[in-house]
C-alpha cells in the first residue's frame, strides 16, 4: 500500500497505516511502528502498549497515535521531515517477525510565502530612475521565478532574481529587483509584484507611480 | 505486484553441487524474512531454510543442516539456496515463499539428484 | 519438533456441500504473548504452486473467498469450506509457524464428486 500526504510547516503530518486485513486481529494482538527512509522508529505500538525505548531521539515527544483510524501525528513537522515513511503491522511469534502489512507514505511539506512585497529604493522624482525591489521569505518548495508587471503590458519585468535558503529551517526566500523610468507621455504607473510556484501565483498589493513632472529623458530598462 | 521468480533447476549428480537463486520483486525485500520449501514428487509439502530480512539468522530442518546454505542479497534482492553433498532424497520442486507465513510463493524449479 | 497431523488424508464432496478438514498439533501453538494461534492452511492447485488462505488460525488472506473458513484454537484446528466450488479441487496443507523448524501437515485432497 502506497500513499501520499501533505503538511504545513510547523503544522501536523498525518501518516496513515490502513488494516485493511483487520478482521478479527485486535491492536493488542499486533506490533505496529512507523520508520522514516533512514530506518529510525518514530513510533512503536506493542501489543497494546506504546514502545518508547525503540523510539529516535528526533521523534520523541513529537508523535501520538490514533488508535482509531490508526494513524500517526506528526507534530510540528520540519522540511527536513520530508521523504518516505513506512508503517509495518506484524506478529512477533518466537521464529521471527511477520508483516501482514507495511504501508508507503511519502511526506513533502510546504510552507506558504509570505505576500510578496514591494519596496522603493529611493523616492520618485521626475528624472531619476524608479528602483524597486520585491520580496517573498519563508516558503517550500522552491519558488519557479518572481517578476514584475506594469500597466498595460503582459510582459515580466525584472532585473535580478535572487533565491536564498535559511540553512536552519531550510524555507525559502526570494526577491527580486527593477529599475524603471516613466516612457514618453505616461504620468501613471500600476506596478505588481508576482511569485510563482509549482502550485500557485501570488501577487503583491499594487504599488501606483504618478510623475511629478514631465520628463524628457524616457527609457525603460 | 509482488513476484517471486526461481532460476532453472536440474539434474545432478549425487555428492554434487547446486546453487538456486529466488529473484524478488514488487515489495521490500529487505523487510521480510524469506524461506524455500520442498515438494517431493507424489508428496506434501517440506520447509527447508529460513533466513532473517536482513540475513543475520539463519534456521534449517535437521536433514539438510550443513549441507543447506540460504542467504540473501538484499541489494540485488536476490534469495539463494545453496545445495552441497546433494543426496537422492533431496529431489523434489524447490519454492521459495516470503516469510514464515508464506504469503507469496515462486512457480517452483525441480532438482533432480539421481546418477 | 511440532507434529502436524491431518484428517481425512481425501475427501470427495458434491459441489454447493459444506466441507470440514481437520488438523492437530503435537503441541499448542498459542503463545501466550500475543494470544494468537501461528497456524496457517494453504491450498495448492494441481501444477501450481500453494496459495496461502488462513494465517494465525482465522484470518482470510486478502482475496480468499469467504466460504473459507478457519477456526480452532491451542492443537485443534479446522478449515472449512461452506460451499464446495468445482475450482477448490485441490490439496490442502496446514502449517505450524511457532517454531523452529517450520512442520506442515501430510494434507488433505479434496475431490469433488
Known amino acids: 500500500v502506497s500513499v501520499e500526504t501533505q503538511a504545513y510547516f510547523n503544522g501536523t503530518a498525518y501518516l496513515p497505516c490502513p488494516f485493511t486485513k483487520a478482521q478479527n486481529i485486535s491492536l493488542s494482538e499486533l506490533v505496529v511502528f512507523w520508520q522514516d527512509q533512514q530506518k529510525l522508529v518514530l513510533y512503536e505500538h506493542y501489543l497494546g502498549t506504546e514502545k518508547l525505548d525503540s523510539v529516535n531521539a528526533k521523534y520523541l515527544g513529537r508523535t501520538s497515535f490514533d488508535r482509531n483510524n490508526w494513524t500517526l501525528r506528526l507534530h510540528n513537522v520540519q522540511i527536513k521531515d520530508m521523504g518516505s515513511y513506512d508503517c509495518f503491522i506484524q506478529k512477533k511469534p518466537p521464529t521471527g517477525s511477520i508483516i501482514l502489512q507495511q504501508t508507503l507514505t511519502e511526506l513533502s511539506v510546504i510552507a506558504n510565502f509570505s505576500e510578496p512585497e514591494i519596496k522603493l529604493a529611493q523616492n520618485v522624482t521626475g528624472n531619476s530612475g524608479i528602483n524597486l525591489t520585491c520580496t517573498s521569505k519563508q516558503g517550500h518548495p522552491k519558488p519557479k521565478k518572481m517578476y514584475f508587471l506594469i500597466t498595460n503590458s503582459t510582459n515580466e519585468y525584472g532585473d535580478n532574481m535572487q533565491i536564498s535558503q535559511d540553512n536552519v529551517t531550510e524555507l525559502f526566500s526570494i526577491s527580486n529587483s527593477l529599475s524603471l523610468s516613466f516612457p514618453d507621455g505616461v504620468w501613471h504607473m500600476t506596478v505588481v509584484c508576482v511569485l510563482e510556484t509549482e502550485s500557485m501565483k501570488i501577487s503583491s498589493k499594487p504599488l501606483n507611480f504618478t510623475q511629478e513632472f514631465p520628463s524628457p529623458q524616457t527609457y525603460w530598462k | 505486484e509482488v513476484q517471486l521468480v526461481e532460476s532453472a533447476g536440474g539434474l545432478v549428480q549425487p555428492g554434487r553441487s547446486l546453487k538456486l537463486s529466488c529473484a524478488a520483486s514488487?515489495?521490500?525485500?529487505?523487510?521480510?524474512?524469506m524461506a524455500w520449501v520442498r515438494q517431493a514428487p507424489t508428496k506434501g509439502l517440506e520447509w527447508v531454510a529460513t533466513i532473517s530480512h536482513d540475513g543475520s539468522s539463519t534456521y534449517y530442518r535437521d536433514s539438510v543442516k550443513g549441507r543447506f546454505t540460504i542467504s540473501r542479497d538484499n541489494a540485488k534482492t536476490i534469495l539463494y539456496l545453496q545445495m552441497d553433498s546433494l543426496r537422492s532424497e533431496d529431489t523434489a520442486t524447490y519454492f521459495c515463499?516470503?516469510?514464515?507465513?508464506?504469503?507469496?510463493w515462486g512457480q517452483g524449479v525441480m532438482v533432480t539428484v539421481s546418477s | 519438533d511440532i507434529v502436524m497431523t491431518q484428517t481425512p488424508s481425501s475427501q470427495a464432496v458434491s459441489a454447493g456441500e459444506k466441507v470440514t478438514m481437520s488438523c492437530k498439533s503435537s503441541q499448542s501453538l498459542l503463545y501466550s504473548r500475543d494470544q494468537s494461534n501461528y497456524l496457517a492452511w494453504y491450498q495448492q492447485k494441481p501444477g501450481q504452486s500453494p496459495k496461502l488462505l488462513i494465517y494465525l488460525a482465522s484470518t482470510r488472506e486478502s482475496g480468499v473467498p469467504d466460504r473459507f473458513i478457519g477456526s480452532g484454537s491451542g492443537t485443534d484446528f479446522t478449515l472449512t469450506i461452506s460451499s464446495v466450488q468445482a475450482e477448490d479441487l485441490a490439496d490442502y496443507y496446514c502449517q505450524q509457524h511457532y517454531n523452529y523448524p517450520l512442520t506442515f501437515g501430510s494434507g488433505t485432497k479434496l475431490e469433488i464428486k
Open positions: 514488487g515489495f521490500t525485500f529487505s523487510d521480510y524474512y
Open positions: 515463499a516470503r516469510q514464515n507465513i508464506m504469503d507469496y
